[in-house]
Interface confidence: low
């Protein structure tokens, strides 16, 4: 049995930030689970992870440099991504794995969400401005 995942087909990040909600055909209450968000058609980049179990506080982290937060619902995880760059416009896929109680469950691959990053171009400002002309 596979968990089904629903995502919005497209989201626009106007201020370099977006909320992406992953809705599951499974109640996460009282489960040990790992929800993750992946970037690219091949899901090669793991953007953000939300991990929950009984004994510790909800863990939200990114190992790939994304600024992310996560919020848990009965049958959903919402990923809040900030400081996105225009060149991070891509398709993003929700993944869910339930480790406990048995059996291990994961999801059918979803259709994904295209996140179109508009807004400000987050370019690093130069440390020293160029010479001013007289």
């Amino acid at each position: 049995n596979k968990i089904l995942v629903k995502q919005s087909p497209m989201l626009v990040a106007y201020d370099n930030a977006v909320n992406l909600s992953c809705k599951y055909s499974y109640n996460l209450f009282s489960r040990e689970f790992r929800a993750s968000l992946h970037k690219g058609l091949d899901s090669a980049v793991e953007v953000c992870v939300v991990y929950g179990n009984y004994s510790q506080q909800l863990q939200v982290y990114s190992k790939t440099g994304f600024n992310c937060d996560g919020k848990l619902g009965n049958e959903s995880v919402t990923f809040y991504l900030q400081n996105l760059y225009v060149n991070q416009t891509d398709i993003y896929f929700c993944k869910i794995e339930v480790m406990y109680p048995p059996p291990y469950l994961d999801n059918e691959k979803s259709n994904g969400t295209i996140i179109h990053v508009k807004g400000k171009h987050l370019c690093p400002s130069p440390l020293f401005p160029g010479p001013s002309k007289p």
Epitope: F29, Y54, Q56, Q57
Partner: nanobody
């Protein structure tokens, strides 16, 4: 000293209703996330429901969703569990617990429990 005192349990027929209460003291109730859990005879502890400190967000286990409602009255330092359409499998000792983190996670204090028996 943290104290959680459950009440409202008893014998009820299938299809009936009960309202459990939990009187809390010894901590700042209005800033504490709270849970109800239950333990059926010979079984492990099962999480039933969770409510965040302000009382806006709630979570339910599949087995009770649509039948049970968790609520709280912060002015009275009291947690409630309204149980409708009760079934024989709801028979258990029900515990009120303080849950410092999110809905899926452990508690740091719980009460002594109140017994709910659903039988005809």
């Amino acid at each position: 000293e943290v104290q959680l005192l459950e009440s409202g349990g008893g014998l009820v027929q299938p299809g009936g209703s009960l309202r459990l209460s939990c009187a809390a003291s010894g901590f700042t109730f209005d800033s504490a996330n709270m849970s109800w859990a239950r333990q059926a005879p010979g079984k492990g502890l099962e999480w039933v429901s969770w409510i965040e400190a302000p009382g806006v967000q709630t979570y339910y286990a599949d087995s009770v969703r649509g039948r049970f409602t968790i609520s709280r009255d912060n002015s009275k330092n009291t947690l409630y569990l309204q149980m409708n359409s009760l079934r024989a499998e709801d028979t258990a000792v029900y515990y009120c617990a303080r849950s410092p983190f999110g809905p899926l996670y452990g508690f740091d204090y719980r009460g002594q429990g109140t017994l709910v028996t659903v039988s005809s």
